[in-house]
């Protein structure tokens, strides 16, 4: 074992070290004092440090672990981070195309459908895009609401012309009657299924997305306990009032401190593990009515098929409905 | 795997799809972020020796310091000394994560859950849960994958999926398409004139 | 122009299954929905059911619910009618047809399938 | 169900002549229905949909009318190519329903 240094020896090496830290030169002894008052480098002998400066270390150790810990999961943050950001921004492209589309095809298609349509399917992609950033919004009201909304203006507009401008209680009528016929036969609920499953798997994506950012967050931001700064101090910087400035930390002496430091810090790991496995099996199912891109994209074409199935069925739906709503339409007439 | 509205309108002027070199799809990004974050997977584990690999340690000096004096780097004093008469590394231990750390425990907990409820489970991507009438008519037989079910691969995989991120330039114009529905069909076929 | 080609004959032994296909071609497959008709030799026709190819969405005659089931693959534009448990009254042509898109009558027709189940 | 009754079940008649089918719903259609022709070991072709509106290419010689239950395709100057089976199909709403065929035979 190396002796230590001789007590005649200064503490010019350790104060311009020190310096580094803290401008001011007032807190290094000129020469090795007992340091009878230290309380994390308890010397073997005289001793470069003061209280002053042992507590200076402790601040200085415990900055540079944050800084550790912030480099460290400077990658895995930014990842994430990224990542959160361009889904969302994906899925409001893809919920903006989906709404497109659907006007597209009222526009080509139901051309005398367009005004109200484009209304309807409007607020249906706004709270479809609601539902994703998390809004609480029941999917199969929004569905409910589309096919509410859309009926009666196809009833008056494409299946029954003839009836003067719609008023409110005829249009109330055929919203009641929408959902007790099942005018538009099972596609309603195809739908919401199809939108419910992939919104809700979109949803749940986005908010892990956005958690594993509050993660790293909370752990970057950790502020380590004072048992904690007194290790690190012990490990990086008590060897400075021994004048021994070049010297290292044993590695395994690196790891006991920071795995004291991190027991905290290193519970998550379970958890976190867990967290990507879980995501991993949530992605491998998003496809087919699981995937949101799929559903949304495609939804232009079951809304489609579900007024051709409405006009198909014209005849016998215009005579229920003819019998069901008689009082409204009478009252319009008058 | 989406469909486009080409589909429904022959003319193909009515969808531009801006090309993109890389046509990565949602999926493919998707699968690609957990890949990257499987690299992490040990990530919390593995902090303790990262901050050491990235802290000054000693690798090939003969001598190390040990919290108390400088010793051989393989000696049994290396690890075990420094942590002589110190403040107990077990208490340290034993006191349990902050708060801050127990909350977003109980966070990553939550979220599993979500996430092992809202996973598809293997073989059953649809679920045998349509099987409303539609309006007096027959629909979804008793044994059937929805209602939509059952051509097995060939099911949504038409068309390629929206050009990651590629913004799609979509004509509205009417203009372009050639006739509609509401008039493509048989040209006396204005359902409204069957109730005269 | 519209064509429908359906699949060969098909001899099977009671209680076995069939599966028919019908091809599109000539228009976009997923605009139109496509039904099923049976056709006894020398009687009349009986509609069994329709496919919307886009959304696979099907629509049964109450009569053909278990007997039949009607699938899609968009990607070759072929329409698919299973028939199970198969009985001698199982023999028959089946057409599959093209409706209009917004009434139920058949512009275009296949060739049909003889199916004749024996022992 | 809707019930379609066809009537008469087989009728001869000669090129020239002047034919009418006619067709019984058992509720009322208003003029949701349709007539096919169909020749032995072909498919059947779509004549008439709406009760009175002529499908592409099919002659003028053929045509519908009647609505309610009461439904009628008469063919006028029979052509030799007319002769076959003919089928009234109501197209109101599912299940849909065919009648039991008219044959039409050469005299």
């Known amino acids: 074992q190396p002796p230590p240094p001789p007590p005649d020896a200064t503490c010019h090496q350790v104060r311009s070290f020190f310096q580094r830290l803290q401008p001011g030169l007032k807190w290094v002894p000129e020469t090795p004092v007992p340091g009878s008052d230290l309380q994390v480098c308890l010397p073997k002998g005289p001793t470069c440090c003061s209280r002053k400066m042992e507590e200076k270390y402790q601040l200085t150790a415990r900055l540079n672990m944050e800084q550790l810990l912030q480099s460290a999961s400077m990658e895995l943050k930014f990842l994430i981070i990224q990542n959160a950001a361009v889904f969302q921004e994906a899925f409001e492209i893809v919920v903006r195309h989906a709404k497109n589309y659907t006007n597209a095809m009222f526009k080509n298609n139901y051309p005398s459908l367009t005004p109200q349509a484009f209304e309807f399917v409007g607020e249906f992609f706004t709270d479809v895009s609601l539902y994703i950033l998390g809004s609480d919004i029941n999917v199969d009201d929004m569905v409910n609401e589309l096919f509410d909304s859309l009926f009666p203006v196809i009833y008056t507009q494409l299946m029954n012309p003839g009836l003067p401008d719609s008023a409110l209680d005829i249009n109330e009528c055929l919203r009641g009657a929408r959902r007790d016929l099942k005018v538009f036969g099972n596609f309603p609920k195809l739908i919401m299924t199809q939108v419910s499953k992939s919104l809700q798997v979109t949803r749940i994506f986005l908010q892990a997305l956005n958690l594993g950012i509050e993660v790293i967050n909370t752990t970057d931001h950790l502020k380590f306990s004072k048992d904690c700064g007194r290790m690190l101090t012990r490990m990086w910087y008590c060897s400075y009032c021994q004048g021994l400035m070049m010297v290292k930390p044993c590695g395994g002496y690196c790891n006991v401190v920071m795995q004291g430091c991190m027991a905290g810090v290193v519970e998550i790991d379970k958890y976190w593990r867990e967290y990507i496995l879980s995501l991993e099996e949530l992605v491998n199912g998003m496809y087919r009515i699981y995937d949101m891109e799929n559903v949304l994209l495609g939804l232009f074409s079951t809304i489609h098929d579900s007024i051709q199935y409405v006009q198909k069925n014209a005849g016998k739906l215009t005579t229920t409905i003819g019998k069901l709503c008689a009082h409204s339409q009478q009252r319009q007439y008058r | 795997s989406a469909y486009y509205p080409e589909d429904l309108f022959i003319d193909k002027k009515v969808l531009k799809v801006a090309h993109v070199e890389h046509e990565e799809t949602l999926s493919s990004r998707r699968r690609e972020l957990i890949q990257k974050l499987k690299s992490f997977i040990s990530f919390y584990s593995a902090l303790p020796g990262y901050i050491c690999s990235h802290s000054p340690v000693a690798e090939n000096d003969t001598l190390c310091w040990n919290g108390q004096e400088l010793v051989e780097r393989y000696s049994q004093k290396a690890a075990r000394n420094g942590m002589k008469n110190q403040f107990n590394l077990h208490e340290l231990k034993m006191k349990g994560p902050e708060p801050v750390v127990s909350q977003i425990i109980d966070k990553l907990k939550h979220i599993n859950q979500l996430l092992r409820t809202m996973s598809v489970p293997k073989g059953r991507v649809l679920d045998k849960n349509l099987d409303e009438e539609g309006f007096e008519s027959g629909d979804c037989g008793d044994d059937e994958d929805e209602c939509i079910g059952g051509s097995g691969d060939g099911m949504m995989k038409v068309k390629n999926q929206l050009r990651f991120l590629a913004e799609l330039a979509y004509d509205l114009d009417v203009d372009d398409v050639p006739g509609n529905n509401q008039q493509a069909t048989p040209k006396d076929n204005e359902i409204s004139t069957f109730h005269n | 122009q519209v064509q429908l080609q359906q699949s060969g004959a098909e001899l099977a032994r009671p209680g076995a299954s069939v599966k028919l296909s019908c091809k599109a071609s000539?228009?976009?497959?997923?605009?139109?929905?496509i039904s099923w008709v049976k056709q006894i030799t020398g009687q009349g026709l009986e509609w069994i059911g329709e496919?919307?190819?886009?959304?696979?969405?099907?629509y049964y005659n109450e009569k053909f619910k278990g007997k039949a089931t009607l699938t899609a693959d968009k990607s070759s534009s072929t329409a698919y009618m299973e028939l199970r448990s198969l009985t001698s009254e199982d023999s028959a042509v089946y057409f599959c047809?093209?409706?209009?898109?917004?009434?139920?009558?058949?512009?275009?027709w296949g060739q049909g399938t003889l199916v004749t189940v024996s022992a | 169900d809707i019930q379609m009754t066809q009537s008469p079940a087989s009728l001869s008649a000669s090129v020239g002549e002047t034919v009418t089918i006619t067709c019984r719903t058992s509720?009322?259609?208003?003029?949701?229905l349709a007539w096919y022709q169909q020749k032995q070991g072909k498919s059947p072709q779509l004549l008439v949909y709406?009760?009175?509106t002529l499908a592409e290419g099919v002659p003028s010689r053929f045509s519908g009318s009647g609505s309610g239950t009461q439904f009628s395709l008469k063919i006028n100057s029979l052509q030799p190519e007319d002769f076959g089976s003919y089928y009234c199909?109501?197209?109101?709403?599912?299940?849909?329903?065919f009648g039991a065929g008219t044959k039409l035979e050469l005299k």
């Open positions: 047809a093209r409706d209009y898109g917004n009434i139920y009558s058949f512009a275009y």
């Open positions: 000539g228009y976009t497959f997923t605009s139109y929905g």
């Open positions: 496919i919307y190819p886009r959304s696979e969405s099907t």
């Open positions: 509720e009322n259609i208003y003029s949701y």
């Open positions: 709406n009760a009175k």
């Open positions: 199909q109501h197209h109101y709403g599912t299940p849909l329903t």
